[in-house]
Interface confidence: low
């Protein structure tokens, strides 16, 4: 059928809770494309009816919730004007007995569920919640060894748990929990995170590679809306933070009042050897003050910038 096959790594998932997977594969999905999801090489596409427990939501496949029988290989077919790519995703579902230590822990966890804190430093854990915009996520609660985390050293900031002055006692089994609302129904999302402590300073030894941007300028008309992706490849065990800054300040903080320029939600695609992360910056309306400023994408120790410039006048 002329489609190029791309195989993603296995995803190991907890039964009885929501799960979503976004069929994005930059740069394939950046243009005008159609995305269709299938299960186990079926010719019948996954339903697009939002009441269905499993359905396609734009480029996402959404399970509300995931169940035992959902294990299998799912394919999303990305068709462009002159191209076709078929991405294979192997989903394995298991039953997690959260606080029953007699049953044992999680199986081979995917890497976002293994995180590292650096001894003596201020560090953070990230709750990876990847869902389409039809899903509304409530505030996140954090647990350690099945007890809700409280204390002065811990601060919940959006999807992160900030830990100040990390100690050896901070290693262990964590979980983040959020209530997800979709079409008036509520579901609990729980991610288990195995946390280890390292004395190694810095960024876990990995230097992320920023694929885009490349320290360049972008021509953009005054008043237009602009979205720019920052694409980063990094090792699977990385603990690097990825964000957009301007004047050495997070864009969400810098434009806190107007909210005219915002950082998007980070997404990632897992490959066998590395992860590809995408976090965008959205200019709701480009203003004169934006021109000439370097907007910096940071990924650990790596940085890259874009500079907006007015298009050259057309004298024709």
């Amino acid at each position: 059928d002329g489609c190029k096959d791309i195989f993603m790594k296995n995803e190991i998932l907890s039964a009885s809770q929501p799960f979503a997977f976004n069929c994005t594969f930059p740069p394939i999905t950046s243009g005008e494309v159609s995305v269709t999801w299938y299960k186990n090489s079926s010719k019948i596409p996954v339903s697009k009816i939002i009441q269905s427990r499993i359905h396609q939501d734009e480029t996402w496949i959404l399970f509300l919730p995931m169940e035992w029988g959902d294990s299998g290989v799912y394919q999303c077919v990305i068709k462009g004007r002159d191209s076709c790519h078929r991405i294979h995703v192997n989903l394995t579902v298991f039953e997690k007995h959260w606080c029953d230590t007699s049953i044992g822990g999680l199986p081979n966890l995917s890497d976002e569920y293994k995180q590292i804190l650096h001894l003596g430093k201020d560090d953070s854990l990230t709750c990876h919640l990847h869902f389409p915009k039809s899903c509304v996520l409530g505030p996140i609660k954090w647990y350690k060894d099945c007890n809700e985390i409280k204390g002065e050293r811990f601060t919940v900031l959006e999807t992160r748990l900030l830990v100040s002055n990390v100690s050896a006692e901070d290693r262990g089994n964590y979980a983040c929990q959020a209530i997800l609302t979709h079409s008036g129904k509520q579901y609990e999302v729980l991610n288990g995170i195995t946390v280890s402590i390292t004395e190694r300073a810095g960024y876990g030894g990995s230097v992320p590679k920023i694929i885009y941007p490349k320290n360049h300028s972008i021509e953009v008309q005054l008043g237009t809306t602009l979205i720019v992706d920052c694409n980063v490849t990094d090792t699977k065990d990385n603990t690097n933070l990825r964000c957009w800054r301007v004047n050495n300040t997070l864009v969400d903080d810098y434009y806190d009042e107007s909210k005219r320029i915002r950082e998007g939600v980070e997404t990632h695609v897992s490959f066998r050897e590395h992860n590809l992360y995408t976090v965008n910056i959205t200019f709701l309306e480009v203003k004169m003050e934006d021109y000439g400023l370097p907007f910096m994408c940071h990924a650990g120790v790596s940085t890259a910038y874009i500079i907006l410039q007015l298009p050259a006048p057309d004298f024709r």
Epitope: Q17, W98, C99, D100, G184, K185, Y187, E188, V189, L190
Partner: nanobody, 128 residues
Framework: EVQLVESGGGLVQPGGSLRLSCAAS????????LGWYRQAPGKQREAVAT????????YYSDSVKGRFTISQDNAKTTVYLQMNSLRAEDTAVYYC?????????????????????SGQGTLVTVSS
Amino acid sequence: EVQLVESGGGLVQPGGSLRLSCAASGYSYRTQCLGWYRQAPGKQREAVATISGGGTSTYYSDSVKGRFTISQDNAKTTVYLQMNSLRAEDTAVYYCAAGLSVLGSWCHGGSSYEYTYSGQGTLVTVSS
């Protein structure tokens, strides 16, 4: 809007049985720890029995172990509490609770009450 509606309470003689039901609407239960707690006049509330959303694990307080059984229907939208060999000290208002994280200590016999939703309660009176 999430609603939990209890039923089945009433007056029963010591040694008798009752079956409480809790029907949920507007809520997808499957991932939650569901259960019952009770509060007698002038006493602290007590977790009586809980069941994980998948039905794979249950918890009973020592005071009801062997006498009470918690279960769910197949659709996991109704939770039952079968109460046998009732005693006078079982007299209390029984509340259905849901929306609690399965990580919350209440689900495993702890003393914190982190459930998100709770019903209006149904009175159980054990008296001769």
